[in-house]
């Protein structure tokens, strides 16, 4: 009689996680009598996947009715495949006995599971940086299989080239993770900018996954200061204005100093937003020119986003005409007491 053969025609089968897999197995003879069992793996640690005689295998069904007379097809159907199901499956013929005796194994079918990558998560730097500095963004995605994957970085739609990508583990595995770090040079116009990490994988059918991060979380645009004075209608008053321009984020503390001594402090409130996302703000003082002493210096000092203060000074200019308007007895503070101390606009 011809020796029984166990035939597993497919060397490998690949399915997407969540789908079903069919593992084919036929035998060439009905003799000797005995059951077929399916195992994942070989050796002493192999797992019983299906045994017709006994056991509960809720995810496994036979393709044909194995109890039918003369049945030689012992293919199985495994539902709801997960990455943990990956491995080599063996169809094994046993000879009936007490206990049953293993007789012959098929060559094995390797089941590989295609699994979608998780949505990419992009994280930026923990501290803000100023324009012209380089910041790093990291993109991570997990749980995909097979290992082949493509990751691209974009800034405002333009592809970036300065990045480094790792896929782990290096060898074969049930599933893989990708981690990529991109380096981005900041510019003053980046408050509205966005970086995008795009992941393409065979399971995504040409529709890549994207993760984004806003550069507004990573950038600090320091302000430029300008201090100037303008005459007011009242001949003995001038308006000294501190113009704070092009800063981001909004957090700003402004202090006026008169000859180095603090005269008032205010927090930026009503800001003007520029098209590029930065902000402008102005603060002013009404100064009584009659109360001046020679060489009064007014300093506008700005502390932006917790950074060391920057300042701009202005020497008060009083014209001869203004001096003439003052009576000899006039005295008091330089800052007009009845005028509002500051303002914004």
């Amino acid at each position: 009689e011809e020796e029984l053969q166990v035939i597993q025609p497919e060397k490998s089968v690949s399915v997407t996680a969540g789908e079903s897999a069919t593992l084919n197995c036929t035998v060439t003879s009905l003799i000797p009598v005995g059951p077929i069992q399916w195992f994942r793996g070989a050796g002493p640690g192999r797992e019983l996947i299906y045994n017709l005689k006994e056991g509960h295998f809720p995810r496994v069904t036979t393709v044909l009715d194995p109890t039918k007379r003369n049945n030689m097809d012992f293919s199985i159907h495994i539902s709801n495949i997960t990455p943990a199901d990956a491995g080599t499956y063996y169809c094994v013929k046993f000879r009936k006995g007490s206990p049953d005796v293993e007789l012959k194994s098929g060559a094995g079918t390797e089941l590989s599971v295609r699994a979608k990558p998780s949505a990419p998560v992009v994280s930026g730097p923990t501290a803000r940086a100023t324009p012209e500095h380089t910041v790093s963004f990291t993109c991570e995605s997990h749980g995909f299989s097979p290992r082949d994957i493509t990751l691209k970085w974009f800034k405002n739609g333009n592809e970036l080239s300065d990045f480094q990508t790792n896929v782990d583990p290096a060898g074969k595995s049930v599933s893989y993770s990708i981690r990529s770090t991109a380096r981005v040079v900041l510019t003053r116009r980046d408050v509205h900018s966005q970086v995008i990490c795009e992941v393409a994988h065979v399971t995504l059918q040409g529709d890549p996954l994207r993760g984004t991060a806003n550069l507004s979380e990573a950038i600090r645009v320091p302000p430029t200061l300008e201090v100037f004075q303008r005459p007011m209608r009242a001949e003995n008053q001038v308006n000294v204005t501190c113009q704070v321009r092009k800063f981001y984020p909004q957090r700003l503390l402004l202090t006026w100093l008169e000859n180095g001594n603090v005269s008032q402090t205010e927090t930026a409130s009503t800001l003007t937003e520029n098209k590029d996302g930065t902000y402008n703000w102005r603060s002013w003082l009404l100064v009584n020119t009659c109360a001046h002493r020679d060489g009064v210096v007014l300093t506008c000092q700005v502390e932006h986003d917790g950074q060391p203060a920057v300042s701009k000074s202005h020497a008060l200019e009083v014209s001869a005409h203004q001096k003439e308007q003052c009576s000899d007895t006039t005295s008091g503070p330089v800052l007009a007491p009845t005028a509002p101390l500051g303002g914004s606009g």
Partner: antibody
């Protein structure tokens, strides 16, 4: 090309726990058994135990109460822990990959680490 | 446990000449599927062991064909058709049928 690299302390005090890690590079943990084998100075080889890719462990009964083998598939590593060591545990410790193609038997320990010498001494 | 016994303990050889090592197991290593789960390893001086033969007679990848394994049940033999200088070291048999896996005591092959 699959490579195995053992790592861990070269000196362990008596009664303490010996901990070794084997890093698998260039290949998969899947479908293989991952073994620890030791060789005392000037002596033969002793199988300590192995772990399959599904986490099932098998130990040498002569060591079973003291040995634990674990697997970290995400790191492509497997580890050996042996408690209450004595001078008799001084040996070269090898990690190795064991193949299984058919039946309940095994089909050769085909990849070995270079071995790490562990001395048990106070 | 299955006990593995190797002979001889030491084997002086002449390069170019054949050599033979015997390994006996305390119980049959022939499984019901027809495979005999016995391996042969060579450990060269200062190196890790290297797989030569598995399932009694199958040569491992990259192993020269001067090495051959035979036997069934409890009696196994490793033959080297023409010994080369690089074959010096300790040869071990190992049963791989059941745990605990067990090794023979080793046969030291050295050049005469």
């Amino acid at each position: 090309q699959v490579q195995l690299q053992e790592s861990g302390p070269g000196l362990v005090r008596p009664s303490e726990t010996l901990s070794l890690t084997c890093t698998v590079s260039g290949g998969s943990i899947r479908n293989y058994y991952w073994s620890w084998i030791r060789q005392p100075p000037g002596k033969g080889l002793e199988w300590m135990g192995f772990i399959y890719d599904n986490g099932r462990t098998f130990y040498n009964p002569s060591l079973k109460s003291r040995v634990t083998i674990s697997l970290d598939m995400s790191m492509n590593q497997f580890s050996l822990k042996m408690t209450s060591v004595t001078a008799a545990d001084t040996a070269v410790y090898y990690c190795a990959r064991v193949r299984a193609y058919s039946g309940i038997g095994l089909d050769g320990t085909d990849v070995w680490g270079q071995g790490t010498t562990v001395t048990v001494s106070s | 446990d299955i006990v593995m016994t190797q002979s001889p303990l030491s084997l002086p050889v002449t390069p170019g000449e054949p050599a033979s090592i015997s390994c006996k197991s305390s119980q049959s290593l022939l499984y019901s599927n027809g495979y005999a789960y016995l391996d042969w390893y060579l450990q060269r001086p200062g190196q890790s062991p290297q797989l030569l033969i598995y399932q009694g007679s199958n040569r491992a990848s990259g192993v020269p064909d001067r090495f051959s394994g035979s036997g069934s049940g409890t009696d196994f033999t490793l033959k080297i058709s023409r010994v080369e200088a690089e074959d010096v070291g300790v040869f071990y048999c190992m049963q791989a049928l059941q745990t605990p896996l067990t090794f023979g005591g080793g046969t030291k092959v050295e050049i005469k």
